[in-house]
Interface confidence: low
């Protein structure tokens, strides 16, 4: 399977909410002992590999923001912890999963990574990630709402299989 990022760049005004999205593509094993661990974290564009560094989002680690379920099942973080930080991650039946960030500030600007780990017998079996940029703007040049820029299908940094 692979992870696709429908949008590679989100440009938002300060104070707005944004939902960053990834999509799980390809065949998903629905075996009785296969689950998927989906999560989000901040990173930087490393020289070797994007998303190799895992940094917290608003002080919440990738472990705080995880979703854990089988295949294309719906799930969302109900943690008070995440919601207190204006964050919520969710997943639907179609392989889409997202993180919503409320009341954006300039400090939220940066590279965001979604990560899916296929787990069999509690071992990490297969790992894929996607990357996208969030730019939070302020002042007269800022858009009135979030503007999203589609990923090019040739952009290998946005569809990564491990």
């Amino acid at each position: 399977f692979k992870v696709a990022t429908p949008y590679s760049l989100y440009v938002c005004p300060e104070g707005q909410n944004v939902t960053l999205t990834c999509r799980l593509l390809g065949p998903v094993d629905k075996g009785h002992d296969v689950t998927f661990y989906k999560t989000w974290y901040r990173s930087s564009r490393g020289e070797v590999q994007t998303c190799s560094e895992r940094r917290p989002i608003r002080n919440l680690t990738f472990q705080d923001l995880h979703l854990h379920h089988g295949g294309h099942q719906a799930a969302n973080t109900s943690h008070d912890l995440a919601q207190r930080h204006g964050l919520e991650s969710a997943s639907d039946h179609h392989g889409n999963f997202s993180i919503t960030m409320r009341n954006l500030t300039l400090l939220d600007s940066g590279l965001y990574c979604c990560l899916v780990v296929e787990i069999r017998h509690h071992h990490s079996e297969h790992r894929v990630h996607g990357a996208m940029e969030l730019q939070v703007q302020t002042g007269k040049d800022a858009p009135s709402n979030c503007v999203v820029y589609p990923s090019s299908s040739q952009d290998s940094e946005n569809i990564t299989a491990a």
Epitope: T35, T61, S124
Partner: antibody, heavy 121, light 112 residues
Framework: EVQLVESGGDLVKPGGSLKLSCAAS????????MSWVRQTPDKRLEWVAT????????YYPDSVKGRFTISRDNAKNTLYLQLSSLKSEDTALYYC??????????????WGQGTLVTVSA | DVLMTQTPLSLPVSLGDQASISCRSS???????????LEWYLQKPGQSPKLLIY???NRFSGVPDRFSGSGSGTDFTLKISRVAAEDLAVYYC?????????FGGGTKLEIK
Amino acid sequence: EVQLVESGGDLVKPGGSLKLSCAASGFTFSSYGMSWVRQTPDKRLEWVATISIGGSYTYYPDSVKGRFTISRDNAKNTLYLQLSSLKSEDTALYYCARHSSIYDGYYGAYWGQGTLVTVSA
Amino acid sequence: DVLMTQTPLSLPVSLGDQASISCRSSQSIVHSNGNTYLEWYLQKPGQSPKLLIYKVSNRFSGVPDRFSGSGSGTDFTLKISRVAAEDLAVYYCFQGSHVPYTFGGGTKLEIK
């Protein structure tokens, strides 16, 4: 700081039952696989049970399968081990252990101090 | 079941010397995902086991670099380059690749 505190160990007669608990703190409990490991009086270590992050999948050696049940309550940050049809060879110090994050896939990253189960007539 | 055989049972060493403990599995412990879940633990009297090495050769956080792990397939080794007084303990290998997961019988490191 990661803390695992086991409780529930006791002296029990052969054929009896017991429920062990492991209270976890200092980490996001629902993000980690957990295991029970026991240490026999002759100091041998024996893996007893493992449970996956969400609690859907459990694994046991044949020596305890059907007699022991591992479970977890992620809302209470607690791991359990239900022991039944106990035998004298189940006498041991029972440890709960937290796995690493799933990305590294190792087992006893952190252990509790153990709770003693003695099976004797 | 995978049998883990540790040698020697007891290892007398002088402080500052190198110590080497062997662990042999009865079959390959390479998991189907390509990883080898071979771990080494240390246990001091009255304490719970502590993780030293995971996945054959990776030192766990806080473990001094005098501890190193190596090996592949069925043969694995733990080396302590300069034995310190606090290293005197029982060492166990463990395989987490195949259910049932199994430990070695232990090696006691003691002063010569």
